[in-house]
């Protein structure tokens, strides 16, 4: 089934190369169990940055080697993408499902806008 | 702290119906699935089925399809089993439970005797 | 129906002593999203039935570690390394992965 994911056009990542916000999706309801992927969308390739599921009793735990970090909060997780390169600049798109109890549901935001500027290196002083 | 009161025992008549209720306290009443179980005396539980507190979308097993009906009274954090028709094996304890991936609360069960 | 088989029925034991209680579904029971909903709970007389284990290994809070949970697809066991006289009362397995959700048919541990 359908639902309705909303996340922010467009984030300036940090000088330190992080980027942080927030993915809202449709009220979960009864919903117990919440699995949150991030997308990243490079010409017609999509690649997976991270995944994480929560349950209601639980918070958001991302795996330990994860380049994401994230809070949830009733139907808004707020997610932080980290070590992000020019290079890593791109659409991220943020992908809901609602996997527990049935139905299932899935929702995909339309992309958020990373932009990535890495910093001028700082000129040698004598 | 996070609790579901029912309500007290029923004494009725075959052909009769009845309405448990099962109060929550403590939480967002409408984050939680609410489970129903029957308890025949010195029996096993049988899950009946459950509810969607949030869209009030009832699923229940085929033993309970029919004269069983599970509602809610969202604004009093409430639901409701109601039993139409009653017969003689519908004597029980039922309990209501909360079910998130589990079912960590419990009402206290309702105990119903149906005699003629 | 996912039909839920606890074995045995009855469990005699010492206080102390270490308990085994078997449960078999009669299908797999992992849901499509991998996780396999397979829950313990144990029922003292005149109580409302209280969670020891959830996704077939997870204690939990409160629970103690003398209770622990294993196995996969149809076959679960739940151990309690020294039963002590407050463990006594019945115990049931249940699946929440396959609607109609189920229970086992309970084994009643109790004193030898």
């Known amino acids: 089934k359908g639902m309705h994911a909303a996340q922010p056009a467009v984030v300036l990542a940090s000088s330190r190369g992080v980027a942080s916000f927030v993915c809202e999706y449709g009220s979960s309801g009864n919903a117990a169990e919440v699995r949150v992927t991030m997308l990243r969308q490079a010409g017609s390739q999509m690649t997976e940055v991270c995944a994480a599921t929560y349950t209601v009793e639980d918070e958001l735990a991302f795996l330990d080697d994860s380049t994401c970090t994230g809070t949830s909060s009733g139907n808004k997780v707020n997610l932080t993408i980290q070590g992000l390169r020019a290079m890593g600049t791109g659409l991220y798109i943020c992908k809901v499902e609602l996997m527990y109890p049935p139905p299932y549901y899935v929702g995909m935001g339309n992309g958020t806008q990373i932009y990535v500027i890495d910093p001028e290196p700082c000129p040698d002083s004598d | 702290q996070i609790q579901l009161v029912q309500s007290g025992p029923e004494l009725k008549k075959p052909g009769e119906t009845v309405k448990i209720s099962c109060k929550a306290s403590g939480y967002t009443f409408t984050n939680y699935g609410m489970n129903w179980v029957k308890q025949a005396p010195g029996k096993g539980l049988k899950w009946m089925g459950w509810?969607?507190?949030?869209?009030?979308?009832?699923t229940y097993a085929d033993d309970f399809k029919g004269r069983f009906a599970f509602s809610l009274e969202t604004s009093a954090s409430t639901a409701y089993l109601q039993i139409n028709n009653l017969k003689n094996e519908d004597m029980a304890t039922y309990f209501c439970a909360r079910r998130s991936i589990y079912y960590p609360y419990w009402g206290q069960g309702t105990t119903l005797t149906v005699s003629s | 129906d996912v039909l839920m088989t606890q074995t045995p029925l009855s469990l005699p034991v010492s206080l102390g002593d270490q308990a085994s209680i078997s449960c078999r579904s009669s299908?797999?029971?992992?849901?499509?999203?991998?996780?396999?909903?397979l829950e313990w709970y144990l029922q003292k007389p005149g109580q409302s039935p209280k969670l020891l284990i959830y996704k077939v290994s997870n204690r939990f809070s409160g629970v103690p570690d003398r209770f622990s949970g294993s196995g996969s697809g149809t076959d679960f066991t739940l151990k309690i390394s020294r039963v002590e006289a407050e463990d006594l009362g019945v115990y049931y397995c249940?699946?929440?992965?396959?609607?109609?959700?189920?229970f086992g048919g309970g084994t009643k541990l109790e004193i030898k």
């Open positions: 509810i969607n507190t949030y869209t009030g979308e009832p």
């Open positions: 249940f699946q929440g992965s396959h609607v109609p959700w189920t």
């Open positions: 299908q797999s029971i992992v849901y499509s999203n991998g996780n396999t909903y």
